[in-house]
Amino acid sequence: EGAAQSNNSLMLQTSKENHTLASNSLCMDEKQITQNHSKVLAEVNISWPVQMARNAVLCCPPIEFRNLIVITWEIILRGQPSCTKSYRKETNETKETNCTDERITWVSTPDQNSDLQIHPVAITHDGYYRCIMATPDGNFHRGYHLQVLVTPEVTLFESRNRTAVCKAVAGKPAAQISWIPAGDCAPTEQEYWGNGTVTVKSTCHWEGHNVSTVTCHVSHLTGNKSLYIELLPVPGAKKSAKLY
């Protein structure tokens, strides 16, 4: 009964989204075409965290279209054969090999736009995406290590007297949990799910009668969230003199 009662007094504190992750494109302005190819080559690999259910646009190196021979997107997803999407300018021909995910497409026709879009991003889209642009001067490429982020569901309840449990369920990557005030906490438990998400559970006890409300703060790449709950009274306690 204590858990149910305590659950009733659960209060949402904050849910702040990290808007730096809301951007769905890392594409450079195509007007600012880099003439210095060494600069392009210096930008070979980009690590990019993207929130699940958003749309993502991945871009090729900014090479002038007139210099192109072939554009190839190579997509390597976990547990799947490598998928390639290519476009040959001379024949205006597109070709796909081992590509089964309909959510990964060219933004428009490759002769108009070489960018790749994922619409919407799913947890299975974790992987490596590389654009290879073949020109008479050689091949130029840009790679993305795409890390799909999943916002954890946060719960807080009092499991027994003055012991609270905070869970960050099915987040990716694992969330971090902290408490105000600090309690006597068991080691944090982590449960790994087959889809790459992690549930983190923190259980803490507060002996001090002067602790009225505890706050569980969950830190995650998708944003932070806090919940707070007033602890139930100590069993058998009727009246406190000065408990603080």
Epitope: Q5, Q13, S212, T215, Y228, E230, L232, K238, Y244
Partner: antibody
Framework: EVQLVQSGAEVKKPGASVKVSCKAS????????MHWVRQAPGQGLEWMGN????????NYDEKFQGRVTMTADTSTSTVYMELSSLRSEDTAVYYC???????WGRGTLVTVSS | DIQMTQSPSSLSVSVGDRVTITCQAS??????LHWFQQKPGKAPKLLIS???NLESGVPSRFSGSGSGTEFTFTISSLQPEDAATYYC?????????FGQGTKLEIK
């Protein structure tokens, strides 16, 4: 939506007692701490204590220890705050609040005057 | 007891200006808090719960930030109806304690 309805204004003589009531609705009465806060004219807010209706557990601020009594009637979802040995400096508006301080009553003015 | 030091105690500001009020918990003890607005003859009205959560129906010009022992309440663009006294309340430890209040006047 939680509603806290408080009893009406009181005028008391020094040395007397006053009992203010606060009737709650819109939430599980026995599952939330109820707090009392007072505010003297032109002054700030002062926490007096709290009661957990589900068990009758109470905490009183040391300043009011021995003069204040908080009780709860679960049949009517009402909490009471009784303050005894009243003095002029107890003239104040008394508020009940719940839901971790997010829901407040409108207040009860208690005037202590000879 | 945790003392909440609120500053400034009063300020006079023009409409459209930005207002910042701070609350600091004593003893370096991390706490959680609410921010209230009180107008004469009225009960305090909760604006920000849990340090930074804007309550439903409260205009977005009000915001709260901070954690641990230092907290800030901000009005981004002061409106005439914002003239009131503002209080912070720490609700982590018994006894709950309020800041001394900040009386905000419109120039």
């Amino acid at each position: 939506e939680v509603q806290l309805v408080q009893s009406g204004a009181e005028v008391k003589k020094p040395g007397a007692s006053v009992k203010v009531s606060c009737k709650a609705s819109g939430h599980t009465f026995t599952s939330y701490w109820m707090h009392w806060v007072r505010q003297a004219p032109g002054q700030g807010l002062e926490w007096m204590g709290n009661i957990y209706p589900g068990s009758g557990s109470i905490n009183y601020d040391e300043k009011f220890q021995g003069r204040v009594t908080m009780t709860a009637d679960t049949s009517t979802s009402t909490v009471y705050m009784e303050l005894s040995s009243l003095r002029s400096e107890d003239t104040a508006v008394y508020y009940c609040l719940t839901m971790t301080g997010t829901s407040w009553g409108r207040g009860t003015l208690v005037t202590v005057s000879s | 007891d945790i003392q909440m030091t609120q500053s400034p105690s009063s300020l006079s500001v023009s409409v459209g200006d930005r207002v910042t009020i701070t609350c600091q918990a004593s003893q370096g003890t991390p706490i959680n808090l609410h921010w209230f607005q009180q107008k004469p003859g009225k009960a305090p009205k909760l604006l920000i719960s849990g340090a930074s959560n804007l309550e439903s129906g409260v205009p977005s010009r009000f915001s709260g930030s901070g954690s641990g022992t230092e907290f800030t309440f901000t009005i981004s663009s002061l409106q005439p109806e914002d003239a009131a006294t503002y209080y912070c309340l720490q609700f982590t430890y018994i006894p709950w304690t309020f800041g001394q209040g900040t009386k905000l006047e419109i120039k």
